[in-house]
């Protein structure tokens, strides 16, 4: 059974998660972004479930092409770089869903924009969190 | 509008340390990047470090092993720990703050804080 503290954990990197994927977002809705229209020409596919922790697999599947799409934005100046965001967020994702788990994903057949992309996996750490407090 | 208040500058011997200290108050995301970049006499600003609100960090390579940025989310502050201090790395330490991963018009930049590394 998991304990408070290992809930509080969850909870946290949940948070982070969160807050990764919504700056991801603030800068692709950015209007002055030039490369947003470039952006969505890419499709993204999207978990038929996302209710679990272990759907997080769908989401660490797709982080490639998403550092891929980022780099677009070619920036001469990046606070944080494309492979920073994304190594971080892997780094928690694979904490979250577990290792040793093999979790076959199971995608949707529609695919989608990557603002359609980070908002569904927003929505499903707000989703999480909301279940954990 | 973003206010952001820089501290704990100052002047030290090479080898020693120093920590940074900026705090950002006014209309704050909660997903945001905060830094700090530099800048020497006659040279251009450039990227210390930098730490999103999700614990996302960048590091120049010149300060990588030495330097070690951290955030309190809570209070909306960065910190900046300094080791192992160059007299190369004298310059004017600016505290950033962004609500995306890239450099824009809307970026928030602090006044500024000396820093001197000399014997």
């Known amino acids: 059974a998991p304990t408070s503290s290992s809930t509080k954990k969850t909870q946290l990197q949940l948070e982070h998660l969160l807050l990764d994927l919504q700056m991801i977002l603030n800068g692709i809705n950015n209007y002055k972004n030039p490369k947003l229209t470039r952006m969505l020409t890419f499709k993204f596919y999207m978990p038929k479930k996302a209710t679990e922790l272990k759907h997080l697999q769908c989401l660490e599947e797709e982080l490639k092409p998403l550092e891929e799409v980022l780099n677009l934005a070619q920036s001469k100046n990046f606070h944080l770089r494309p492979r920073d965001l994304i190594s971080n967020i892997n780094v928690i994702v694979l904490e979250l869903k577990g290792s040793e788990t093999t979790f076959m994903c199971e995608y949707a057949d529609e695919t989608a924009t990557i603002v359609e992309f980070l908002n569904r996996w927003i929505t499903f750490c707000q989703s999480i969190i909301s279940t954990l407090t | 509008e973003v206010q952001l208040v820089e501290s704990g500058g100052g002047l030290v011997q090479p080898g020693g340390s120093l920590r940074l200290s900026c705090a950002a108050s006014?209309?704050?995301?909660?997903?945001?990047?905060m830094g700090w970049y530099r800048q020497a006499p006659g040279k251009q600003r450039e990227l210390v470090a930098a730490?999103?609100?999700?614990?996302?960090?960048n590091y120049a390579d010149s300060v990588k092993g030495r330097f070690t940025i951290s955030r309190d989310n809570a209070k909306n502050t960065v910190y900046l720990q300094m080791n192992s201090l160059k007299p190369e790395d004298t310059a004017v330490y600016y505290c950033a703050y962004a609500s995306s991963f890239y450099e824009d018009e809307t970026d928030y930049w602090g006044q500024g804080t000396q820093v001197t590394v000399s014997s």
């Open positions: 006014g209309s704050i995301f909660s997903s945001n990047v």
């Open positions: 730490i999103s609100s999700g614990g996302s960090t």
